[in-house]
């Protein structure tokens, strides 16, 4: 947002919530009152758009112009015209002004001469008041260019070629007010420049490319109120009082500059300095005394800079501030008592922030503070005198739940119920089964025991949001650094690998019978076990690593309140981030990319065996169900990991990533496949249809059996279990024949094609 | 500590340009401007004129326009002044001096000593 | 241009004894700013001219307290209260509100009686 639509913006907002209601009402710490009447609501109530008191009080005053907007007006009500394509509203229509060149328009003693390719500044009559030369194609201003406009007060020079001004460029323009030279290429302004400038007021000097001021600089400013040198490419402010030459100073914006540190004399004479905003540039240091003069100072802005360390007494003399943004700094840790001094606080903005020391103690002795701003909701608890406190969610948890979403709330145990349930099934099916592949069985119940994993995890998580229901700040930065998040969270990780390496397992071992089929060596019990163990050993490994270096890791598990570290956010320990990459963007990628390319490869082998085959219309037939049930395993995969490859890429690239995301893909993508997985590897086969059909048959049969009071006796069911979505047809289930789908590569192509129908 | 160093005296014929030079060290060279005056024997002093080496701008006594052509040279920190087609009039000691604002001189060289004889 | 007339031409002192330089300048030195912009040199024999008072009254560093100027409009002085052999010289004042050119008066010399 440039400097003008800030101005802009807060013109018309300004004054906009002034009202305040309720100052007698007396409430509870965390409680709020509702204007003038008797209620109270707590601090998560306020300020969240919705009209909690009934009289549409704990919704006033939420805006937050504390800062210069409140004296905006005095100064700086008609900012805005600097942006406006016309700046003038000149009383009388018809033009006053003597000589006024062809292309230009002029109104009272007005002149516009916008976007009119003047290459130098025009001639005309001494009386002009106003002149505007904006986006022309002025290069230098020369000596004397505006010596006879004794009259003018505002010069408008934005968006031009200027880049060389002389020393006696501006003289003679003894009652101008405003001069706006923003958008050029200056990258030296000449001590004396503005030495008969005595009545300007605003000087505004934004997108030039200027690399050192000094004091004499501004020579001459001495009515100077507002200074404004936005991104521009200054490295350091002089170690000489800035303002000597403008002692009436009120207003100074440096934002977006490369200034590395701020030293103790430069701001020496500016007392009356009001607004100082130092966002966007490179300062790593500041000194105790930096600020001590500026006790008028009402707005310090320092945010976004390389600051790692607060001085303890550095805001001491600040008595007057109102409003203060760290913002986006990398301070490694706020002194107990940083903010002690600055009792006429009312707003404060730590976002990105990590407070590792965190506690009430800091903010207590901030009284009038209305506003706070955090990195975490989670840190709201820890100011709760603070009727605004910002964000009041990350997108995953709200102040009130950990689970923000009604939906999710809701569908955290719909899933959870669905995956446990499903997995549970087709363990608990296992005795009623006699299988002829114990070991496919193995891996079936391995898969089914990570995939249950996943759906204990959504109930601890919907426990814990049931749990924390109305009250989850309160316990949220100690949820996320407990115990418990870090385990359930790496439950989580482990269910999520040894799922995907199970899955790819199979999946290679099914390629390498069908792609291979004269290659292929049936695996026997000890290789089969040997992989299960390994991969059941991975997974712990690469859930539990994370717990075994906090100093490496940090919280790695605890970012959100769903303890799953999806993406990675700007202050994780870069080893966090590499980990979380290399498990997203190296494990699982990497067997997403196998499954598809195995799954594919089958499908094309078999549908290459099929063209040889001599029942056409069968052949398609059977082929389409194979491609429909291989589509459904990839589509499923694709549908879980897809999204979640593109969220962590995309954090990556540093793309800010909602955290809604995270709480969206936790309870509806990741949980896809572990809920899926029996339905497509074992519900949805034909031995389980048939088998459950059998054992609809016999219950049938024994129902009439006992109703003629006849014993009946349930033949023995013999499930040649063959690997997901692959059945035998009835004609080729003979035991000592296929024990092992890799046998298959003893049958004819056409027959390879009927088994999987 | 801030030092103007001009060279000793310079003797040149009628009509042939000479270009005197004035090295500055101590201070920030492209920060201030160097003004040229010239001072004859037993007189006054006469400002010539003043240069700024950020941009070279060039504000010259309108009596001196066709004489004298100041140049700088950032690398070396060195302000230079050419004049044009000297004649006996233009024997004189030339000092550079530098401002910051174009007000005073606050450092003086020694001076050079110009001598035009043939 | 502006001219700067001073008196006396030349200035007889004894040392110890207060020495008084005028100037006077063809039109006010008076800036639109408000700043008075007159300026006061030293020239020692075969010396470069040296800063000695700046802006009618200010003291350039290390000039000693006995120097002072005073003035107003087109009327200045400067004054050496104790006058010492070191302060032999041509004083020159200079005017640098209307500019270019910088202007400078005669000079004035001072020496011992």
């Known amino acids: 947002m440039t400097s003008g639509s800030v101005f802009f913006y807060i013109l018309i907002f300004g004054k906009y919530f002034s009202h305040g209601g309720g100052q007698d009402v007396k409430c509870s710490l965390g409680y709020f009152p509702c204007g003038n009447i008797t209620k109270c609501l707590p601090q998560l109530l306020h300020c969240n758009g919705v009209d909690d008191c009934g009289n549409q009080a704990d919704e006033d005053n939420c805006g937050d112009n504390n800062g210069w907007s409140l004296q905006f007006d005095k100064y700086f009500a008609s900012y805005y015209k600097m942006t406006s394509q016309y700046p003038f509203e000149a009383e009388t229509p018809e033009c006053l002004v003597g000589s006024v060149p062809v292309q230009c328009l002029c109104q009272g003693l007005e002149l516009d001469c916008d976007e009119t390719n003047l290459r130098a500044v025009p001639s005309v009559s001494s009386n002009v008041t106003a002149m505007s030369l904006q986006w022309n194609l002025i290069r230098k201003l020369p000596p004397d260019c505006f010596k006879n406009y004794h009259d003018l007060q505002k010069l408008y020079l934005q968006n031009n070629k200027i880049t060389s001004i002389s020393i006696y460029a501006f003289r003679g323009l003894n009652s101008l007010t405003k001069l706006y030279l923003s958008h050029n290429r200056i990258t030296f302004l000449k001590p004396g420049v503005f030495e008969d400038l005595h009545r300007l007021e605003w000087l505004i000097i934004e997108d030039n490319h200027l690399s050192r001021i000094s004091p004499p600089t501004f020579y001459g400013l001495n009515s100077l109120i507002l200074l404004v040198l936005m991104n521009n490419v200054l490295t350091r402010l002089p170690d000489k009082p800035l303002c000597q030459h403008m002692p009436r100073l009120h207003w100074l914006d440096l934002e977006g500059n490369h200034i590395h540190n701020l030293r103790n004399l430069t701001f020496i004479s500016c007392s009356n300095l009001t607004v100082l905003v130092m966002r966007k540039n490179k300062i790593n240091h500041l000194n105790e005394n930096t600020f001590a003069p500026l006790q008028k100072l009402d707005e310090l802005d320092l945010g976004s800079n390389k600051i790692e360390n607060l001085p303890p007494l550095i805001f001491k003399d600040l008595k007057e501030l109102s409003q203060l943004n760290l913002s986006y700094n990398p301070i490694q840790k706020i002194q107990a008592n940083q903010f002690d001094y600055l009792v006429k606080l009312k707003s404060l903005s730590l976002e990105g922030i990590e407070i590792s020391n965190i506690q009430q103690r800091m903010f207590r002795p901030l009284m009038n503070l209305s506003h706070i701003y955090f990195k975490k909701f989670q840190y709201c608890g820890y100011a709760p005198h603070v009727r605004s406190c910002k964000p009041n969610t990350d997108g995953i948890s709200s102040l009130e739940n950990l689970l923000a979403s009604i939906i999710q709330r809701v569908f955290v145990w719909v899933v959870s119920a669905v995956t446990c349930f499903g997995n549970i099934f087709v363990i608990c099916m296992r005795p009623y089964i006699r299988s002829e592949n114990k070991l496919y069985a193995m891996s079936i119940i391995s898969l089914c025991c990570a995939d249950c994993l996943m759906g204990i995890y959504l109930f601890v998580i919907g426990g814990f949001d049931l749990k924390f229901r109305g009250e989850y700040n309160k316990h949220a930065q100690l949820w996320m650094e407990s115990t418990h998040c870090q385990l359930v969270g790496s439950l989580a990780i482990l269910s999520t690998e040894v799922s995907v390496l199970l899955l790819t397992f199979l999946t290679l071992e099914k390629y390498i019978c069908i792609v291979y089929p004269f290659r292929c060596v049936r695996p026997g019990k000890c290789r089969t076990i040997t992989v299960l163990i390994l991969i059941w050993i991975t997974g712990f490994i690469v859930a539990f690593i994370p717990l075994s270096n906090k100093e490496f890791f940090k919280n790695y598990y605890g970012t959100n309140g769903v303890c799953f570290p999806l993406h990675s956010e700007d202050t994780e320990s870069i080893g966090a981030q590499i980990y979380s990459v290399a498990i997203f963007l190296g494990i699982n990628l990497a067997a997403f990319i196998i499954i598809v390319f195995s799954y594919g490869s089958m499908f094309y082998s078999v549908h290459q065996s099929a063209i040889t085959a001599t029942e056409i219309r069968n052949q398609v037939k059977k082929e389409m169900i194979l491609a429909k049930r291989f589509f459904f395993i990839v589509f499923t995969d694709a549908l879980c990991w897809i999204p979640i490859f593109v969220v962590k890429f995309l954090s990556l690239l540093q793309v800010e990533i909602p955290g809604t995301i995270t709480s969206w893909v936790v309870i509806f993508i990741l949980p896809i496949n572990s809920a899926l997985n029996p339905i497509l590897y074992t519900l949805t086969t034909r031995p389980f249809k048939e088998m459950i059909h059998r054992f609809w048959y016999n219950y049938r049969q024994r129902k009439s059996m006992d109703s003629k009071g006849q014993k009946t006796y349930a033949p023995s069911f013999i499930w040649v279990e063959m690997w997901p979505l692959q059945e035998m047809p009835p004609e080729l289930m003979k035991p000592d024949l296929f024990t092992y789908p890799c046998e298959m590569s003893l049958i004819s192509q056409s027959t390879r094609l009927n088994s999987y129908s | 500590q801030v030092q103007l160093q001009q060279p000793g005296p310079e003797l040149v014929r009628p009509g042939a340009s000479v270009t005197l030079s004035c090295k500055a060290s101590g201070y920030s060279f492209t920060s201030y401007w160097m003004n040229w005056v010239k001072q004859r024997p037993g007189q006054g002093l006469e400002w010539i004129g003043m240069?700024?080496?950020?941009?070279?701008?060039?504000i010259l006594n309108q009596k001196f326009k066709d004489k004298a052509t100041l140049t700088v040279d950032k690398s070396s920190s060195t302000a230079s002044m050419q004049l044009s087609s000297p004649t006996s009039e233009d024997s004189a000691v030339y000092y550079c001096?530098?401002?910051?604002?174009?007000?005073?001189?606050?450092?003086w060289g020694q001076g050079t000593t110009l001598t035009v004889s043939s | 241009d502006v001219v700067m007339t001073q008196a006396p031409l030349s200035l007889p002192v004894s040392l110890g004894d207060q020495a008084s330089i005028s100037c006077r300048s063809s039109q006010s030195l008076v800036h639109s700013n408000g700043n008075t912009y007159l300026h006061w040199y030293l020239q020692k024999p075969g010396q470069s001219p040296k800063l000695l008072i700046y802006k009618v009254s200010n003291r350039f560093s290390g000039v000693p307290d006995r120097f002072s100027g005073s003035g107003s409009g087109t009327d200045f002085t400067l004054k050496i209260s104790r006058v010492e052999a070191e302060d032999l010289g041509v004083y020159f004042c200079?005017?640098?509100?209307?500019?270019?050119?910088?202007?400078f008066g005669s000079g004035t010399k001072l020496e011992i009686k």
């Open positions: 200079s005017q640098s509100t209307h500019v270019p050119p910088f202007t």
């Open positions: 001096a530098r401002c910051l604002l174009p007000h005073y001189f606050d450092y």
């Open positions: 240069i700024h080496p950020s941009d070279s701008e060039t």
